[in-house]
Amino acid sequence: DPASKSRSCGEVRQIYGAKGFSLSDVPQAEISGEHLRICPQGYTCCTSEMEENLANRSHAELETALRDSSRVLQAMLATQLRSFDDHFQHLLNDSERTLQATFPGAFGELYTQNARAFRDLYSELRLYYRGANLHLEETLAEFWARLLERLFKQLHPQLLLPDDYLDCLGKQAEALRPFGEAPRELRLRATRAFVAARSFVQGLGVASDVVRKVAQVPLGPECSRAVMKLVYCAHCLGVPGARPCPDYCRNVLKGCLANQADLDAEWRNLLDSMVLITDKFWGTSGVESVIGSVHTWLAEAINALQDNRDTLTAKVIQGCGNPKVNPQGPGPEEKRRRGKLAPRERPPSGTLEKLVSEAKAQLRDVQDFWISLPGTLCSEKMALSTASDDRCWNGMARGRYLPEVMGDGLANQINNPEVEVDITKPDMTIRQQIMQLKIMTNRLRSAYNGNDVDFQDASDDGSGSGSGDGCLDDLCSRKVSRKSSSSRTPLTHALPGLSEQEGQKTS
C-alpha cells in the first residue's frame, strides 16, 4: 500500500528522543527495512544505528528490572538477617552482662579471680554463633577443666597444689563430675541452640548472597535480540501503540531467565529448611531459653562445686594422693553462700515470636521468586496488553500470539520459539549457586537434628575445604585440648571492644 510507505515517524521520534538519543538519527518517514538485523524487515522508522541503540537499551532495561527485583529480595533478607542476628547477640550479651553484674556478689573471688575465663567463654560462644569453625563441645570441656583447676586451688588455699597435682585433678575430673549436671546440660542444650541460631542466620546470609550473585549474571546475546524484538520492534514497524502479548512476553523472559528458574527447587528446599528450624527456637532447649541463660548454668555449676567440695576433695586425694599443706597458707576457704539463681527459663520477650512470624510469612512470599520472575517482570515492567487478543504485538505484527507458553527452567526451553537457548550449556555461576543452596540446606537439616556441622565458607568458586582429623601437636589425645582451627569471617559484624581497667581490650 503506497500510502503506508510515506507514513510519518513522529511517534517513533518522540519515543526515541525521550530515551535520550539524538533525533537526527530518526528518518522523517518510513524507509525500507532490509538493513534491520533483529526486527522484521518491513517498512520501518528505524535505521541500523537506531535498532542497535534500542537493542542495547532494551537489554539494559531488562537487566535493571532484574536487579531491582533482586534488590528488593536482598533487602528483605538482609533486614531479616540483621534483626535475628541483633536478637541472638543481644541474648548472649544480656547473659554476659547479668553474669558480670551478679556473680561478684554471689561468688566473690571465685568469680572475680576467674573473670577472664568467663569472658573468654562468652567470646568463644559469640565466635561459634557467628560461624567460626570451633568445636563447641571441646571449647566447653576446656573451659570446665580450666575452671575446675582454678576453683579447686581457690577452695583449698591451705594446700600446696603444684602443676602435676593439678594435672592429676584434670584427669580425674570427668569421673568426679565436680560441677554436677550443669556442664552436660549446657553442652547438650547449647550445641542444639547455637547450631540452630547460627545456621538460620547463615541461611539468610547464603540466600541473600545467592540473589546478589545471580543478579550479576549477564543476559546472553540471544536474549538481547529477543527482548529488543519484544519491546521496541513494534515502534520500528510503525505500530508503537501495540503492547506485547502476555504469552509472547512470558516466552521471551522464560528463555532469557531459563538458568535462573533452575534455582527454584533448591531455593524452595532452603527456605523450607529455614522455616522448619525455627521450631528449634522454642522450649527448654530453644535458642531464647538457652542463649539468654548461659549464666544460670554457670552459677549452677559453681554452686554444685561448692556443695560437693568435701566429697570432691576426698575423691581427689584418693586418686591423686595427699597434697602437702602450705605452712603459710590460710585455713580452708569457708563455704560461701550459694549464688542466687535467676529462673532458668527466661520468660519469652515476644520479640523472637514476632521476628519468626514475620520471617515465615516473608519467606513463604518469596518461595517462588525464581519461577515467577518472568511473569512478574512481564506484568510489572513490560506494559503488557491487557488481553491475549489479536491487537497485541506478537513479535511480527499486531495479532494473536499462537505458540504455547514454555515450561520453567533450562531443559524446557528446547523449543522456545522466541529465544534460542542452548540447553547443553548451563550457566556456571548459577550452577555454583545451586550448589551453595544445597550445602546450606544440608547444614540446616543437620542443625535441625541437633548436629554440629563444620561450617565451610560458601566461597565464590563453589569449592570448600574438608576437615580431617589430623593433629598439629601432642595434645590431640587430651580430652580438653582445643581443636586447632581457623575461624571464618564473621557473618555480620565484630563486636566492639570492651575495656578492662587499665588494659585496653580490642577485638
Epitope: L475, R482, Q501
Partner: antibody, heavy 118, light 108 residues
C-alpha cells in the same frame, strides 16, 4: 614439648617499624593466650599486652597502646608484634610468653633483641 | 596500676647462707596471683615460684615462698652458687600485669 621460637635480632632506624614473630609448637596454639614482655636495662620487665589466638581478643597495657600491635596467624601457629615509630627508648629485648591457665607466664621465647640506631 | 617494690635491689650471699628477698605490693592481692621468676644473664626468665608458694617443676626444695595481702617473700634456705641470678616478682591480679624491678643475687 612446648616451645616458643622468636625471630632473630633487628637493627632498625629511628621512626621505622619492626615486626617480630613468635612461632609456637608442642601444644594447641588456640588454647592459650600469648603475652609480650619488654626487657630494657632501665625499666626491668614490662608487660606489653596479651592476645587470645582463638578469639583474637587483645588487651594492651595502655602505655604501649600506640606503640605495639599484636596479631596472630592461626594457620602457622605464630604470634606477631609490630612496633612502630621506633626511638632509642624502644631498644630492648622483647619476649613472647605463654600462660598456663590464666595465671602465670609458664613458657617463654628466647627473646628478640631490637636495636634502634641511626 | 599495681606497683611491685622489690628489696634489696642487689645482694651477695655466701654458700650455705639463708637468703630472703621481699616484694611489696601497692595494693592487696590474692596470694594465688603472686609469682616469682628467675633470670640468668643472656637467657629468658624462668617460672620459679607460682601462687606465692608453689615451686615450679625442677626448682630445688631449698627455695620457698610465702606472704599474703601486700607483702611477699622468696627464701633460699641455703645459698648455692647456681642460685646466683636475678629474681623478679610479678602480679596477675589486675591489668596491666606488673613486675618488680628485680633483685640481683650474687654469690660471695
Amino acid at each position: 614439648e612446648v616451645q616458643l621460637q622468636q625471630s632473630g635480632p633487628e637493627l632498625v632506624k629511628p621512626g621505622a617499624s619492626v615486626k617480630i614473630s613468635c612461632k609456637a609448637s608442642g601444644y594447641s596454639f588456640t588454647g592459650y593466650y600469648i603475652h609480650w614482655v619488654k626487657q630494657s636495662p632501665e625499666k626491668s620487665l614490662e608487660w606489653i599486652g596479651e592476645i587470645n589466638p582463638s578469639t583474637g581478643d587483645i588487651t594492651y597495657n595502655q602505655k604501649f597502646k600506640a606503640k605495639a600491635t599484636l596479631t596472630v596467624d592461626k594457620s602457622s601457629s605464630t604470634a606477631y608484634m609490630q612496633l612502630k615509630s621506633l626511638t632509642s627508648d624502644d631498644s630492648a629485648v622483647y619476649y613472647c610468653a605463654r600462660e598456663r591457665n590464666y595465671d602465670r607466664f609458664a613458657y617463654w621465647g628466647q627473646g628478640t633483641l631490637v636495636t634502634v640506631s641511626s | 596500676s599495681i606497683v611491685m617494690t622489690q628489696t634489696p635491689a642487689l645482694m651477695a650471699a655466701s654458700p650455705g647462707e639463708k637468703v630472703t628477698i621481699t616484694c611489696s605490693v601497692s595494693s592487696s592481692i590474692s596470694s594465688s596471683n603472686l609469682h616469682w621468676y628467675q633470670q640468668k644473664s643472656e637467657t629468658s626468665p624462668k617460672p620459679w615460684i607460682y601462687g606465692t608458694s608453689n615451686l615450679a617443676s625442677g626448682v630445688p626444695v631449698r627455695f620457698s615462698g610465702s606472704g599474703s595481702g601486700t607483702s611477699y617473700s622468696l627464701t633460699i634456705s641455703s645459698m648455692e652458687a647456681e642460685d646466683a641470678a636475678t629474681y623478679y616478682c610479678q602480679q596477675w591480679s589486675s591489668y596491666p600485669l606488673t613486675f618488680g624491678a628485680g633483685t640481683k643475687l650474687e654469690i660471695k
